[in-house]
């Protein structure tokens, strides 16, 4: 048999058959099933759901479905000693206390085991002191406070609004500023869309709603006690003092009703400009401390959460490939939720479930994919991407040799406006071609392609007639596959028309109000957006696993490398005098990019012409495509971030959610004008240019003719 015959027993088993089998009604049913009780990582409820998914994937027809367990560090509130924040008077009496829980949504009043809002991995402590309002607690916010306003956060409790950047970066910045505690709150300016009602009457955040979330700075390490290695039965665990990424000061999240009570009394400096003001009826004074009448009052935090080594469970399903069983295409998304997980993660898990069911249906009819497809239901994503990272650490040797692609499948929706895709440039053409074949679910685009509605609503800033595709950052389970192992990765979901609020999430993110009803009533009553996301994610997996030649276009990497080189050069050129003084040149990088472009172009020509019936040559060309992403990995990693090893992309050092290009050079240049030793600082810039240039050149050479 030819390779084509082996994977397509009958001609009807093609992409269309797979896509036609996907049903919105099934996704809806699965979402309901997954969201009736909380599935917090490390709990019995989440273990039971893992076993249910294992059983159902087996029924759907996968070849094998196994549980992979690890014992990792998790964090929980103390059930008998709740966390809260007080305003205390001069006698130390608590005159105001923040709420201990979110008012439960209608129909969920009697549900047990709803974890109260907390910041996972906060240390215990009861600091008291004056409050300083630090806006979003971004790097630039602390620069404004410390450098321009001369406000010292040392020994203060800071209050920061959620949004713009990952909460862990906020806490890290506060620690570096000397704060002794952090209060995080959701300001309606960021979590309340004008003209929309609060839940349960709409999709906005009510005043008592609170965003949970971890506040780690793991930088890709996985389990804080076993960085680099799986947290298995014989693991050597670090002591808590040596654990990776744990915060050193107490942190607690609150809603905007409680925040109002803290912020309305703030005195001290006025906000520096309107960008520091939210939507509450408070002055947004920076402080420190309260105004006149209340100047003797202080804020006190009461945090009693505990860190505990706890067992977690991934579900790993396998659909063996007929021709290249040793090549893996992975579809993975997490299962654990903060509470009900109506959007995060179960809108994604329900889509994965339906994709598995569709693949299983085809398999039962005699079809197999060309390559092996692995399906994963990850645990403990909310606690720092732990399940996916531990599994990848355990299987790293297999993955680095056999991993073709990883498609992430967390929340399918964060809005219902248009598609949002973040992926490696290798997948741009795959995504473009696929979306041209899919129908748009959008109103006003009946009979039009998804590509057309997506391009209209979210145009590329560089190329007219094309949609925006963003860089991969982090904050989700693709991190270990892409940033550590160099496996081509992508993600897709439906999003909002809210470009300015890109990293704030949807209003009810990580709150108790993220329910099935939120999705069914307000976001996607017909589940048509979920179906479209299933088609995109599933279609990508199908093509990656089944196309004879891998659907990667290395020329698209050449285009972005030039763009990124131009961008980092222009940043450096803000310091022309220093570049001259320290002989900083980007010639090596631009030369490497030019070489990459030429070699990629030649490779693409050969890819069109080679004999696809020759399995050895086919395998060779596919391996060059598969290993191209791997070629961008530096085994030494980025400075102080050994698990971020991709030289072209890394999560921003200032916002884990955002991707940064040429991160080594970018970080070396960041705030360079403030460095005490400019010679050393510019020396590091030069070293990073060298590393980047070498890596691009080395990657280019992997695409050269092999002999």
């Amino acid at each position: 048999k030819s390779s084509n015959e082996a994977t397509n027993i009958t001609p009807k088993h093609n992409m269309k058959a797979f896509l036609d089998e996907l049903k919105a009604e099934n996704i809806k049913k699965f979402l309901y099933n997954f969201t009736q009780i909380p599935h917090l990582a490390g709990t019995e409820q989440n273990f039971q759901l893992a076993k249910q998914i294992q059983s159902q994937w087996k029924e759907f027809g996968l070849d094998s479905v196994e549980l992979a367990h690890y014992d990792v560090l998790l964090s929980y509130p103390n059930k008998t000693h709740p966390n809260y924040i007080s305003i205390i008077n001069e006698d130390g009496n608590e005159i105001f206390n923040t709420s201990l829980f979110e008012p439960p949504p209608p129909g969920y009043e009697n549900v047990s085991d709803i974890v109260p809002p907390f910041s996972a991995f906060s240390p215990q402590g009861m600091p008291e002191g004056d409050l300083v309002y630090v806006n979003y607690a971004r790097t630039e916010d602390f620069f404004k406070l410390e450098r321009d306003m001369k406000i010292n956060c040392s020994g203060k409790i800071v209050i920061a609004r959620y949004g713009k950047v990952f909460r862990g970066n906020k806490v890290k910045n506060a620690q570096l500023a000397g704060a002794k505690g952090v209060i995080l709150y959701s300001d309606p300016a960021d979590y309340f869309a004008p003209g929309v009602k609060s839940y349960p009457d709409g999709w906005n955040l009510p005043g008592g709603g609170v965003q949970r979330g971890n506040i780690l700075n793991l930088n890709g390490a996985g389990d804080p006690l076993t960085p680099g290695y799986p947290a298995n039965e014989y693991a050597y665990r670090r002591g808590i003092a040596e654990a990776v990424g744990l915060p050193s000061i107490p942190v607690h999240p609150i809603g905007y009703y409680d925040a109002q009570k803290l912020l309305e009394k703030m005195g001290g400096s006025a906000p520096p400009d309107s960008s520091w003001r939210g939507s509450l009826k408070v002055p947004y004074n920076v402080g420190p401390g309260f105004t006149g009448n209340f100047s003797t009052q202080k804020v006190k935090m009461h945090i009693h959460s505990t860190n505990e080594v706890t067992r977690i469970y991934n579900v790993i399903g396998t659909l063996r490939g007929a021709v290249e069983p040793d090549r893996y295409v992975i579809l993975g998304g997490h299962r654990d939720s903060w509470v009900f997980g109506g959007i995060d993660p179960q809108s994604g898990a329900a889509v994965v479930h339906e994709i598995v069911r569709s693949f299983g249906t085809l398999k039962k009819e005699g079809w197999r994919p060309r390559r092996t497809i692995l399906f994963a239901s990850w645990d403990a994503e909310e606690f720092g991407l732990l399940g996916s990272t531990e599994w990848a650490e355990e299987n790293s040797r297999l993955l680095q040799e056999r991993g073709v692609a990883y498609i992430n499948a967390d929340s399918s929706i964060e809005g219902n406006y248009t598609l949002r895709v973040d992926c490696t440039p290798l997948m741009y053409s795959l995504v473009h071609n696929l979306t041209k074949e899919l129908k748009s679910p959008d109103e006003g685009f009946e009979g039009k392609s998804l590509y057309e509605s997506w391009t209209k609503k979210s145009p590329s800033p560089e190329f007219s007639g094309m949609p925006r595709i963003s860089k991969l950052g982090s904050g989700n389970d693709f991190e270990v596959f892409f940033q550590r192992l160099g496996i081509a990765s992508g993600r897709a979901r439906y999003t909002k028309n809210w470009e300015t609020n890109k990293f704030s999430g949807y209003p009810l993110y990580h709150s108790v109000y993220e329910t099935y009803e939120l999705v069914e009533k307000f976001y996607d009553p017909m589940f048509k957006y979920h179906l479209t996301v299933a088609q995109v994610r599933g279609g990508m997996v199908f093509e990656l696993a089944n196309s004879i030649v891998l659907p990667f276009d290395c020329r698209d990497y050449a285009v972005v490398l030039r763009k990124y080189a131009d961008k980092i050069y222009s940043i450096s050129m803000k310091h022309p005098q220093e570049m001259k003084t320290y002989s900083v040149s980007f010639d090596s990088l631009f030369s490497a990019v030019k070489n990459f472009t030429e070699i990629a172009s030649k490779f693409s020509e050969r890819l069109q012409d080679f004999d696809k019936s020759n399995p050895i040559v086919l395998r060779m060309m596919n391996d060059q495509l598969m290993f191209l992403e791997r070629a961008f990995i530096d085994p030494l990693g980025l400075p102080d971030r050994p698990f971020y090893r991709h030289v072209i992309y890394a999560p921003s050092s200032h916002n884990k959610y955002a991707g940064e290009s040429f991160p080594g050079i970018y970080d070396a240049l960041f705030d360079i004008e403030s460095k005490v030793d400019p010679s050393k600082a510019w020396g590091e810039v030069k070293r990073q240019i060298y590393v980047a240039a070498f890596t691009v050149q080395a990657a280019a050479e992997t695409l050269s003719e092999v002999a």
Partner: antibody, heavy 120, light 112 residues
Framework: QVQLVQSGAEVKKPGASVKLSCKAS????????INWVRQAPEQGLEWMGG????????NYNENFKGRVTMTIDTSSSTAYIELSRLTSDDTAVYYC?????????????WGQGTTVTVSS | DVVMTQTPLSLPVSLGDQASISCRSS???????????LHWYLQKPGQSPKLLIY???NRFSGVPDRFSGSGSGTDFTLKISRVEAEDLGVYFC?????????FGGGTKLEIK
């Protein structure tokens, strides 16, 4: 649903004090300030002040300073206003009203009113 | 204190007519956070006041769309596009930007 139920009508002599109550239900009492507004016969509305059930903080209209005391009992979700040294000018309907917090910051729910008559 | 001046004192209308009430404040009602806390209430005979419009132009829950608010700074207007019998009563503007909160003197909407 949000409800504010006020105590019954009062008749007082000049120089006396009166204490009115306002029992709240249907929402989390500590999240919303309670305002007191009065309306003299055939007159407009006059804000007397407000109290925050969360911390007991009060904000009085200067016109009533020294004569008005607002208190709360969080255990029964009840707000109280006491007005002393009454004169005939204090004859009015006294309303409690919930301060609606974000996004309203307006009095989004009112009690039915308590009529206070000051007469010798 | 911020003085709120409402005009007219009385507004006789026929059912189905448009009605317009003006409210002027003695100082700007723009809060330091950029919002304007100017609200409109309706008090029907024998009843407590009820919130109609908050923050200049936002209809409160359940308020028909024939009511609209506009204005900025110190000048504000409430419009009723087609007056219905249930709209009759006294309309008050009010500000909660500055303490003490203050109310306009009221405008009585009555049948011609």
């Amino acid at each position: 649903q949000v409800q504010l139920v006020q105590s019954g009508a009062e008749v007082k002599k000049p120089g006396a004090s009166v204490k009115l109550s306002c029992k709240a239900s249907g929402y989390t009492f500590t999240y919303f300030d309670i305002n007191w507004v009065r309306q003299a016969p055939e007159q407009g509305l006059e804000w007397m002040g407000g109290i925050s059930p969360g911390d007991g903080n009060t904000n009085y209209n200067e016109n009533f300073k020294g004569r008005v005391t607002m208190t709360i009992d969080t255990s029964s979700s009840t707000a109280y206003i006491e007005l002393s040294r009454l004169t005939s000018d204090d004859t009015a309907v006294y309303y409690c009203a919930r301060d609606g917090n974000f996004p309203y910051y307006a009095m989004d729910s009112w009690g039915q009113g308590t009529t206070v008559t000051v007469s010798s | 204190d911020v003085v709120m001046t409402q005009t007219p004192l009385s507004l006789p209308v026929s059912l189905g007519d448009q009605a317009s009430i003006s409210c002027r404040s003695s100082q700007s009602l723009v809060h330091s956070n950029g919002n304007t806390y100017l609200h409109w209430y309706l008090q029907k005979p024998g009843q407590s006041p009820k919130l109609l419009i908050y923050k200049v132009s936002n209809r409160f829950s359940g308020v028909p769309d024939r009511f609209s608010g506009s204005g900025s700074g110190t000048d504000f207007t409430l419009k009723i596009s087609r007056v219905e019998a249930e709209d009759l009563g006294v309309y008050f503007c009010s500000q909660s930007t500055h303490v003490p909160y203050t109310f306009g003197g009221g405008t009585k909407l009555e049948i011609k």
